[in-house]
């Protein structure tokens, strides 16, 4: 299937101009290669009419151009002074020959249609309303007024001033006068449908002295907007239906032959195929809303329609907007696992892709929640502090420049299962969805810390050890001190355990961390983890409490600090901003109630999460060592 996309059918009128936009995949080769527009002949040959190399055929001389927009990955063919001879089959494409990647476009140029004379002309969109003006002479003021619709043989009554209304216009048609003007009456027809299009006659009076006016009403179907998106990327449908439907339920549906199947609406309906990867966000009081879909699949391609109706379902005679979505399978977004599996008590390291051209963008991780319209409160970000209920068990590691950042979540429980999104404040296409599945653990964890009840005594030396199995032998081991700005890796020194060895003694594989002397600031969460280069693996967490030496103290941690703080399930997730005391630096780009929140977060905090003293200070030594 060709990855080039454009409009399948273009129609115009003699003398007018057209612009045809063709989309191509985002690669350096595509941006620089030849773009062409050719006409298909009966033989199957495609004759170049214009190309980006500067070629312009005789028949297009002075009336056409081709412009490449590499920043948008599109090129546009503009043709002016169209004639009926321009009707035909064309291709827009890329490549050195006209047999390269291409898309078929059919262009139809019609004769100039005449506007009927002595006729009032109205052009309205489906679902809107029209007010028809019907002028008459003063002498017909007392007479009956009416509007009828022309059919083949007769003129079928729509409404008249005696309150007679055609059944198909009941509740939709109103006949009225304005103020004291006795020379014009009006007919308003609401919830226009295709069937309302046609010729009407306004009449005041009867017989030869009657005033008649021809009315031509056109009802327009929306023109689909073309959307070109990469596989695994995201798309936002921006729907603007107008103030008249501001208070109605909104929906997005996908065309399926004759019907339109609702994918999501504001009444809580959601297609299971979109679970975990869709949000609907009302924008304002003017009937505007948006629907965001992430993790695009090839089967998501097709025609979409948004609308509004109290039922949350498509309804004839209500305003709609349409799109045609093309999913380009030659995606720049890397193919990553969409399902990550973990076990209770264990950990997961999730690699989030981002546009490598935007390494300085702010990175976020949010949890998709399906209640209501769906939202995605941010749990952690490069400049957003970790949400309170994830204290000690969630961190984001940014690896600038390589197009990936890692989110680690440990001390897993079954409550953590669900959908999570990786996103940045940069290129919104690079939003990806991960499903986290958490199974009950059936064996001991790979990493184990001793002592389990860790209470260090102020001023003394304290060592904790992290035991790891032989399978992690060749990987880099590390300890880091967790804070709500990340997990700061501690300096380590190898205690010579890495000399080549044929056997691996399961019991002696450990990496230790020593605090010497212990200070009050050392209290907190520490992680032991493994990684290979920039790829993070498993982690385990331990809470180290610090207490002053007391005579006869048994050093038992009174609150069992290693037990994960229980999250109150009743607690409501704040979906529009992280609570003030939790994070002064940055508003939560949460549910994307406002797309701009994500774009602007970079301006809000200059604090750098990655900074921090990695060495020792004030004669204290913080180190970890491997055996």
């Amino acid at each position: 299937k060709s990855p080039i996309f454009g409009p399948q059918e273009v129609s115009s009128i003699e003398g007018d101009s057209v612009s045809i936009t063709c989309y191509y995949p985002d690669t350096s080769v595509n941006r620089h290669t030849r773009k062409y527009w050719c006409r298909q002949g009966a033989s199957g040959m495609c004759t170049t009419l214009i190309s980006s190399n500067g070629y312009l055929s005789k028949e297009y001389s002075g009336r056409a151009n081709l412009i490449n927009f590499p920043e948008n990955n599109t090129f546009v063919i503009n043709i002016e002074q169209l004639t009926q001879d321009d009707t035909g089959s064309y291709k827009c494409g890329l490549g050195t020959s006209n047999r390269g990647l291409s898309f078929d476009v059919s262009l139809e140029v019609s004769q100039v249609p005449e506007l009927p004379s002595d006729t009032h002309v109205y052009t309205k969109d489906i679902g809107r309303n029209v007010t028809i003006e019907c002028p008459f002479k003063r002498e017909n003021a007392p007479s009956k007024k009416s509007l009828c619709k022309k059919t083949n043989q007769s003129c079928e009554l729509v409404i008249d001033s005696t309150e007679k209304v055609n059944p198909s216009y009941i509740g939709r048609a109103k006949l009225f006068m304005k103020g004291t003007d006795l020379t014009v009456f009006y007919v308003n027809i609401s919830h226009l449908t295709h069937n309302d299009a046609g010729l009407y006659i306004c009449q005041a009076g009867e017989g030869p002295s009657a005033d008649k006016k021809n009315v031509d009403l056109q009802v327009l179907a929306p023109e689909p907007e073309l959307l070109y998106k990469d596989l695994r990327s995201s798309v936002t449908f921006e729907c603007d239906l107008g103030r008249e439907v501001a208070n109605e339920a909104k929906y997005l549906c996908r065309m399926n032959k004759e019907t339109c199947d609702v994918i999501i609406n504001t009444l809580g309906k959601r297609d299971p195929d979109f679970e975990g990867r869709i949000l609907i966000t009302p924008k304002d009081d003017n009937g505007r809303f948006s629907v965001l879909i992430t993790g695009l699949r090839k089967e998501d391609a097709g025609h979409y329609q948004c609308g509004a109706h109290s039922s949350g379902l498509p309804q004839e005679g209500w305003p709609i907007q349409t799109w045609q979505l093309f999913v380009n399978e030659e995606s720049t977004i890397p193919n990553r696992r969409s399902v990550v599996k973990g076990v209770t008590g264990g950990s997961v390291a999730i690699a989030c892709p981002y546009n490598p051209k935007e390494s300085s963008s702010l990175k976020y991780w949010c949890r998709w929640e399906g209640d209501g319209n769906g939202h995605c409160p941010v749990l952690v970000g490069t400049q957003a502090q970790v949400q309170e209920e994830y204290e000690g068990r969630l961190a984001l590691f940014d690896q600038p420049g390589n197009g990936t950042y890692t989110v680690i979540l440990n001390q897993l429980t079954t409550e953590d299962a669900g959908f999570y999104w990786c996103l940045t404040n940069g290129d919104s296409r690079w939003r990806t969805t991960i499903e986290l599945q958490v199974a009950e653990a059936t064996r001991e964890p790979n990493l184990e810390v001793t002592p389990q009840n860790a209470t260090a005594v102020l001023g003394e030396t304290f060592t904790v050890s992290c035991h790891y199995p032989c399978k992690f032998y060749s990987q880099e081991k590390y300890w880091c001190k967790w804070s709500n700005k990340g997990c700061h890796i501690l300096p380590s020194h190898d205690e010579g355990a890495r000399q080549s060895s044929v056997s691996c003694d399961q019991s002696s594989q450990l990496v230790s961390m020593t605090l010497n002397p212990v200070s009050k600031e050392d209290e907190g969460w520490y992680w032991c983890g493994v990684k290979q280069g920039q790829t993070y693996g498993e982690t385990t967490a331990i809470y180290i409490a610090v207490e002053e030496r007391t005579r006869g103290s048994s050093h038992v941690n009174p609150t069992d600090a290693n037990a994960r703080a229980k999250v109150a399930l009743e607690e409501e997730v704040v979906d529009s901003s992280i609570s003030e005391k939790e994070n002064k630096a940055i508003p939560n780009p949460g549910p994307f109630a406002n797309e701009r929140e994500i774009q602007n977060v970079g301006d809000q905090a200059q604090e750098n999460r990655a900074s921090g003293d990695a060495g020792s200070a004030d004669g204290q030594s913080r180190s970890s060592s491997s055996k």
């Epitope: 115009s12 007018d16 009032h120 969109d125 023109e223």
Partner: nanobody, 123 residues
Amino acid sequence: QVQLVESGGGLVQAGGSLRLSCAASGRTLRSYIVGWFRQAPGKEREFVAAVTWSDGRRVTADPVKGRFTISRDNAKNTVYLQMDSLKPEDAAVYYCAVSRGGAYEYSRAYEYWGQGTLVTVSS
């Protein structure tokens, strides 16, 4: 709100040609009728031509039929008036206007207007 800007007017000899442009901004013209009117000094505003944006149906007033052509460019949200075989009586300020519908030959049906462009035809 629709903003309209006319351009292309100027001085031309009788028998010559001019092409006027009317560029619209603020919103799409999809459900509008776009009309050209003209007003010579001391005279009433007179209908010249109109086009329905959606389907390109058009009409030209009798005094200019066969000499003036109205056309549109969807991508540029622009309407043109090609004026050929100009006569001294064509001299006027030419206005572009848009209407949501009604009696397209009457200026009262048009709700948004441009500032006009002057066409002078010397004999």
